[in-house]
Amino acid sequence: NRCKKAPVKSCTECVRVDKDCAYCTDEMFRDRRCNTQAELLAAGCQRESIVVMESSFQITEETQIDTTLRRSQMSPQGLRVRLRPGEERHFELEVFEPLESPVDLYILMDFSNSMSDDLDNLKKMGQNLARVLSQLTSDYTIGFGKFVDKVSVPQTDMRPEKLKEPWPNSDPPFSFKNVISLTEDVDEFRNKLQGERISGNLDAPEGGFDAILQTAVCTRDIGWRPDSTHLLVFSTESAFHYEADGANVLAGIMSRNDERCHLDTTGTYTQYRTQDYPSVPTLVRLLAKHNIIPIFAVTNYSYSYYEKLHTYFPVSSLGVLQEDSSNIVELLEEAFNRIRSNLDIRALDSPRGLRTEVTSKMFQKTRTGSFHIRRGEVGIYQVQLRALEHVDGTHVCQLPEDQKGNIHLKPSFSDGLKMDAGIICDVCTCELQKEVRSARCSFNGDFVCGQCVCSEGWSGQTCNCSTGSLSDIQPCLREGEDKPCSGRGECQCGHCVCYGEGRYEGQFCEYDNFQCPRTSGFLCNDRGRCSMGQCVCEPGWTGPSCDCPLSNATCIDSNGGICNGRGHCECGRCHCHQQSLYTDTICEINYSAIHPGLCEDLRSCVQCQAWGTGEKKGRTCEECNFKVKMVDELKRAEEVVVRCSFRDEDDDCTYSYTMEGDGAPGPNSTVLVHKKKDCPPGS
């Protein structure tokens, strides 16, 4: 029980120890105030005096999924949850991906000089592209953007004539330009594409990351539709520049990317000189936020760069582009089919104190953590939201910025669930209602949550004990102990006030009244109470565990005497003078103890005299020095010296006999033999 063990000084500290900890504010309560609710109640704290932080969970927005709609949907859409540190909550999420959904396809192409043949092929393939899209969905848009790199040294040749025309028959260099916003008009797309000319730059890595970011955040300019699948084809044959990779240090561009849209009226990116390229994590986050799925269509030469990069995107595709991009349509078709069967659900904007985990019994997870789904059916996912107790070794309640946030639980293709989630780090209200320098605390402390919090120099339940030094707890320390009152009470005014409503006793609370001797599992045999670690027995009982009756009732023999006169009664039992000779209840003679081989000794003579069988048959039985008497019934074993049974090998029947007297065979002793043998069936 962590609540009990924690060295807490206040209600708030207590309820932060563990999700199950509660605090008793009852002024009359004398046990540990910090405990589980169940144990506080059991210890006598009134329910209304118990402070417990209640977690809460409510769905704030829930529109049922409509499978007739051709769009991605998720339910619920909003919820509010408050958890105690260390607590977790499970709930279900439904996600629907229609068989066919609207598609927005934006092609972002590297326009450096080496890509001229690829541009020519794309111009020729406009019609083919439209055909593939129409096979996938009846509702699509298509758009086009181009990028080269930052127009600055060292990325670009800054000589005036090269800025005008970096290569023969080429356009001036630029960072990114949205050429064709997403449109349903394929002819317009084809026509605008025809007029495009290649550009150029100096270094091999391109500024594609600037372009991807602008494509993601400039929703209106690009024309992304809210309920469609957003595909971004990124086509290049070069590597990429990324945040702080050195190129911008040389260029003198130092400030971080602000993740905002910076396109002018012509669709051209304007902040290429003032802002750095974005980082990979930034792109992953922003593409997920805007439901954009990247398709990297790259040549063999640059494949290795993008092979690693694409794994950072939970749902993405990577394809090898032929040197002249002639296979772009096939590559797209394959990528689209692969993407459509994968769904990623991730928690965006989550504070560090909250962990979200999504699993599904319906769908398998892929290597990248996305789910392999079946479209057209409602998928059910299990969400586990957990409030951490510590973040980097610090209790979460000491980290306000890590305690709450609006977590966006978002699947790849739709808006997802907004979770207003937080960790309960409230201060106990009783601490806000303290009695300052209260009379209850002898004016030397504040009365808070049912107890006194004493001013320095004062201690005790009512702060009436003046404390100055360690010597004040010295009287409460048992020799060899380092905890005052054995850790089972409070040292007040130099003496121990033990916890537990009488459970602990003694000068140092050293006696645990739950640790007295037990009989059959009962403390003091349920015939006494525990005090100072010893049983104090009820009248009529004695012994260390009150298991000895003082009465002789259980020692009285059949003649009304005590132990047949052969012993004394102690603790309700006969203690016989010659223990081995008597049965252990009331000192009756145990003849089998006196003559352990008596049955065997009598056997052959009984057989010979009663039945004329056995090892003495044929010889006279005269040497047998006792008489045999045949009887109809034998007495019970406890009424005779000995009762014997043996099998007669001659007829396989069992015979029985008893002996009376003092157990010594002789002329005066008689052996009674049962007339009837006990024979097996059919004999």
């Epitope: 009695e435 300052v436 320098r437 209260s438 009379a439 209850r440 002898s442 004016f443 030397n444 504040d446 009365f447 001013s455 320095e456 120099g457 004062w458």
Partner: antibody, heavy 120, light 107 residues
């Protein structure tokens, strides 16, 4: 209007006792503790002790435990302090003041003070 | 017991002047400090409680500040009725103790 009215000045002989009174009016007598404070001539103030008019329970500054005895009469809303075995050291002005059951505000109203002179 | 040391013990000042009286505790008193004014006729009147809170009916020219062991009372502009004896008092821990007093007199 809250008022703490103290008895008149007293001239007493060494070894004798004196009982000072403090009559409260303008508030509920049992809702506030009554404290007593000593001020020797030209000196600062010293806290003697206090009494709970409701229960009669008292608490004394260790220094005055054998000197002062506090009591109340709820029927007349009056607090008393008896000083015994008087010596010249006890010559001083004695004030009564009130203090709420708890709070940030200690002594909000004071009596006018009573001068005790110990002389043979 | 907590010792309260008040400085200065006497302070000559003129009308309209701004004055500050200091009070130091022998250990931290958690802001549980009051200031009292004692007039020549012996009547005692509370001015400030809990370091900086003005007692009702006390003019706003009186103010208090401080924390830990060091506290002060400031009168922004002296009026004729302000020339009196001033005491600080801690009520963090009993016995509640007073400072030695500061006599504010007309220069």
């Amino acid at each position: 209007q809250v008022n703490l009215l103290q008895s008149g000045a007293a001239l007493v002989k060494p070894g004798a006792s004196v009982k000072l009174s403090c009559k409260a009016s303008g508030y509920t007598f049992t809702d506030y503790y009554i404290f007593w404070v000593k001020q020797s001539h030209g000196k600062s103030l010293e806290w003697i002790g206090y009494i709970n008019p409701n229960s009669g329970s008292t608490n004394y500054n260790e220094k005055f435990k054998r000197k002062a005895t506090l009591s109340v009469d709820k029927s007349t809303n009056t607090a008393y302090m008896e000083l015994s075995r008087l010596t010249s050291e006890d010559s001083a002005t004695y004030y009564c003041t009130r203090r709420a059951y708890y709070g940030y505000n200690p002594f909000d109203y004071w009596g006018q003070g009573v001068m005790v002179t110990v002389s043979s | 017991d907590i010792q309260m040391t008040q400085t200065p013990s006497s302070m000559p000042a003129s009308l309209g002047e701004r004055v500050t009286i200091s009070c130091r505790a022998s250990r931290g008193i958690n802001n549980y400090l009051s200031w009292y004014q004692q007039n020549l006729d012996g009547t005692i009147k509370p001015l400030i409680y809990y370091t900086s809170n003005l007692q009702s009916g006390v003019p706003s020219r009186f103010s208090g500040s401080g924390s830990g062991t060091d506290y002060s009372l400031t009168i922004s502009s002296l009026e004729p009725e302000d020339f009196a004896m001033y005491y600080c008092q801690q009520y963090d821990s009993s016995p509640w103790t007073f400072g030695g007093g500061t006599k504010l007199e007309l220069k």
